[in-house]
């Protein structure tokens, strides 16, 4: 690395992946192993995040960017940059303070995370229940009862699920 020349701050020309080394007359030095600088003009390099324990490495650290972690199997990320891991539950369950609990009757969860959500109320759209809901799946709404009378034709597709509320605890 050449010594930078700047009338203002000699460090401003140090690129990402380097730091301005005061111990070496403000020469731009490369970041040491297991550290990075994501912007230019840095006077120090930041220590790379290590993905250990419940975390695993999604993206390795480089001289210009930090490592990125995700969670080991059985957990999923929470928070900005996966700052925590939360335990997975099975489909048909939600995570409570006492652990994974089955969805109450009338609610469902089709994922390993999140809350149980109420089944769609088909009658709100004037439709009937074509397929009953389960703990893992929402109901499927079919044509309205009037559409099923003799002479009625086409089957309307199910209405999109409404924005769910919290399930009762």
């Amino acid at each position: 690395f050449e010594r930078t020349r700047s009338l203002q701050d000699p460090c401003s020309n140090c690129p990402a992946g380097t730091f301005c080394d005061n111990n070496r007359n403000q020469i731009c030095s490369p970041c040491p192993p297991n550290s990075f600088s994501s912007a230019g003009g840095q006077r120090t390099c930041d220590i790379c995040r290590q993905c250990k324990g419940v975390f695993r490495t999604r993206k390795e650290c480089s001289s210009t960017s930090n490592a990125e972690c995700d969670c080991t199997p059985g957990f999923h990320c929470l928070g900005a940059g996966c700052s925590m891991c939360e335990q997975d539950c099975k489909q048909g369950q939600e995570l409570t303070k006492k652990g994974c609990k089955d969805c109450c009757f009338g609610t469902f969860n089709d994922q390993k995370r999140g809350i149980c959500r109420p089944w769609t109320n088909c009658s709100l759209d004037g439709k009937s229940v074509l397929v009953n809901g389960t703990k893992e799946r929402d109901v499927v709404c079919g044509p309205s009862p009037a559409d099923l009378s003799p002479g009625a034709s086409s089957v309307t597709p199910p209405a999109p699920a409404r924005e769910p509320g919290h399930s009762p605890q």
Epitope: V54, S83, M84, E86, Q87, G99
Partner: nanobody, 116 residues
């Protein structure tokens, strides 16, 4: 920057004891629930024990009655006293920030091996 430094692991015979320590820095320790978890290669990470900021403790069924968690807010340290150790306690042990169901591990871990 959050830092957790675990220590106290080692090789111990079945029935023996160990005391793990975790020194924390980079956050307000006294306000945060802390804990311990463990990882055996090829198995799911297992939460072991936790202690709230008020000192309320909680344990996994597999260690209840054998392990004791405690904290010293003046020293920013959380401890895990492990007695009556069994071969199935062999694992890498990690200090945790957070509760029983959601937490983060920010240290290198300390290896505990229970073997005769």
């Amino acid at each position: 920057q959050v830092q957790l430094v675990e220590s106290g692991g080692g090789l111990v015979q079945p029935g023996g004891s160990l005391r793990l320590s975790c020194v924390a820095s980079g956050f307000v320790f006294s306000t945060v629930t802390m804990g311990w978890g463990r990882q055996v290669p090829g198995k799911e990470f297992e939460w072991v024990s936790g202690v709230s900021s008020e000192g309320i403790t909680d344990y996994a069924d597999s260690v209840k009655g054998r392990f004791t968690i405690s904290r010293d807010n003046a020293k920013n340290t959380v401890y895990l006293e492990m007695n009556s150790l069994k071969s199935e306690d062999t694992a890498e042990y990690y200090c945790l920030i957070g509760g029983r169901w959601s937490f983060g591990t920010w240290g290198q871990g300390t290896q505990v091996t229970v073997s005769s």
